[in-house]
């Protein structure tokens, strides 16, 4: 912190420019105008200071504004949005989409900060609901910030957001999360043809249904373990053995390795044993020979 | 965003240097540059500035005239031309720069030592 001295004769600052930068510390702190710079913030996005000299800057703001900052200043924060802590944030009304741009840029290209993270919540809580405006804003940024969100908040997502996903951004999406996201992708991608059609909706499929995955397994797309390890258990189950060995193609053998993990495990014990046999992997644990396989779900149903 | 400076070293009382400043993973040609000094035990010094298009130019009082500063964007680099070295010019020098929205970066710094 800058002790307070009187500022010399002459170096009043009257406007933010880039005489500034020939300044000490404590002759920002003295010679600058709090109500000056909250004003002209602007300006300093355009003044190549030191990291030291936007401390001093950050620190008059905070005086000025102890209970947090008016959006006319916080959409001119650039880089000092950085040095906030998530409880100056957290003081701050967000309600334009501009600012909240504005903001995202500074951080563009790196994770998403802590800032980040409460500068959204306070956006979304400031708004009361999360429209397609900000979430087109968000996932344009934070792809992966889909996965942060509830099936019923995805459930606005426009399927144009889907197309900025990258396979990374769904490593934490549950199976609830993508079986929202899926048709979404599938409406998406709809008009790819098939080769680039998989590449694309390849990590959305743990939201596929069944009839979808057997689709799949006649075009040749030779699925790889790990996105198959992924698929939900019950669209994975009644697919049949043939159908699981194109769905594969030459990744059927990595079948062995996952035998004892869901959805292979469960997948197995669905299947008759001489079927597995044909696939000459030595799978066991499908339905042994002669015997009958009823379909209680489907009973029930019709009782 | 990181820059890189370069050009330092030891040179004689009235001799010359000239620093430059380049960009590490991003182009340069849209920031303001400003060129800073620390010498030991002191606080860090602005010495000029130049503007993204080269236009505008600023500079201390302690170097007015002995010093200039330019850019070239087709080399993605910002010059400091310094003549007529005095001992007190002894410094790490460093570049910092701001662009859209305000984004960032400072370099690490390069020697010169007037002796």
């Known amino acids: 912190e800058v002790e307070k001295t009187a500022c010399p004769s002459g170096k009043k600052a009257r406007e933010i420019d880039e005489s500034l930068i020939f300044y000490k510390k404590w002759e920002l702190e003295a010679c600058v105008d709090a109500a000056l710079l909250a004003t002209q913030m602007d300006r300093v996005n355009a003044i190549p200071f030191t990291y030291e000299q936007l401390d001093v800057l950050k620190h008059k703001l905070d005086e000025l504004y102890p209970q947090g900052y008016p959006e006319s200043v916080i959409q001119h924060l650039g880089y000092l949005f950085l040095k906030m802590s998530p409880e100056d944030i957290r003081k701050w009304n967000v309600t334009s989409l501009e600012t909240l741009k504005a903001l995202l840029e500074v951080n563009k290209g790196h994770e998403m900060s802590p800032q980040v993270a409460t500068l959204i919540d306070r956006f979304v809580k400031g708004r009361g609901q999360l429209d397609k405006d900000t979430l087109d804003t968000l996932t344009a940024f934070y792809p992966g910030y889909l996965c942060s969100l509830s099936p019923e908040e995805l459930s606005s997502v426009p399927p144009s957001s889907i197309w900025a996903v990258r396979p990374q951004d769904l490593d934490t999406c549950d199976p609830r999360q993508l079986d929202v996201l899926y048709p979404k992708a599938r409406l998406a991608f709809q008009n790819m043809n098939g080769s680039e059609y998989f590449v694309k909706i390849q990590s959305f499929l743990g939201g596929a249904p069944t009839e979808d995955l057997k689709a799949l397994s006649q075009q040749n797309v030779s699925m790889d373990l790990a996105t198959f390890m992924k698929l939900r258990t019950d669209a994975v189950l009644p697919l049949t053995v043939a159908e699981v060995q194109k769905l594969l193609g030459p990744h059927v053998e990595g079948l062995k390795a996952e035998e004892r993990h869901r959805p292979v495990r469960d997948w197995i014990l669905r299947q008759r044993q001489d079927d597995l046999d044909t696939l000459g992997l030595g799978l066991q644990g499908g339905i042994p020979n002669g015997y009958l396989v009823l379909d209680l779900s489907m009973q029930e149903a019709l009782s | 965003l990181q820059l890189v400076e370069s050009g330092g070293g030891l040179v004689q009382p009235g001799g010359s240097l000239r620093l430059s400043c380049a960009a590490s993973?991003?182009?340069?040609?849209?920031?303001?540059v400003g060129w800073f000094r620390q010498a030991p035990g002191t606080e860090r010094e602005g010495v000029s500035s130049?503007?993204?298009?080269?236009?505008?130019?600023n500079y201390a009082d302690s170097v007015k005239g002995r010093f200039t500063v330019s850019r070239d964007n087709a080399k993605h680099t910002v010059y400091l031309q310094m003549n007529s070295l005095k001992p007190e010019d002894t410094a790490v020098y460093y570049c910092?720069?701001?662009?859209?929205?305000?984004?960032?970066?400072m370099g690490q710094g390069t020697s010169v030592t007037v002796s």
């Open positions: 910092a720069a701001v662009g859209d929205y305000g984004r960032r970066a």
């Open positions: 993973g991003f182009t340069l040609d849209s920031y303001a």
């Open positions: 130049i503007s993204s298009s080269g236009g505008s130019t």
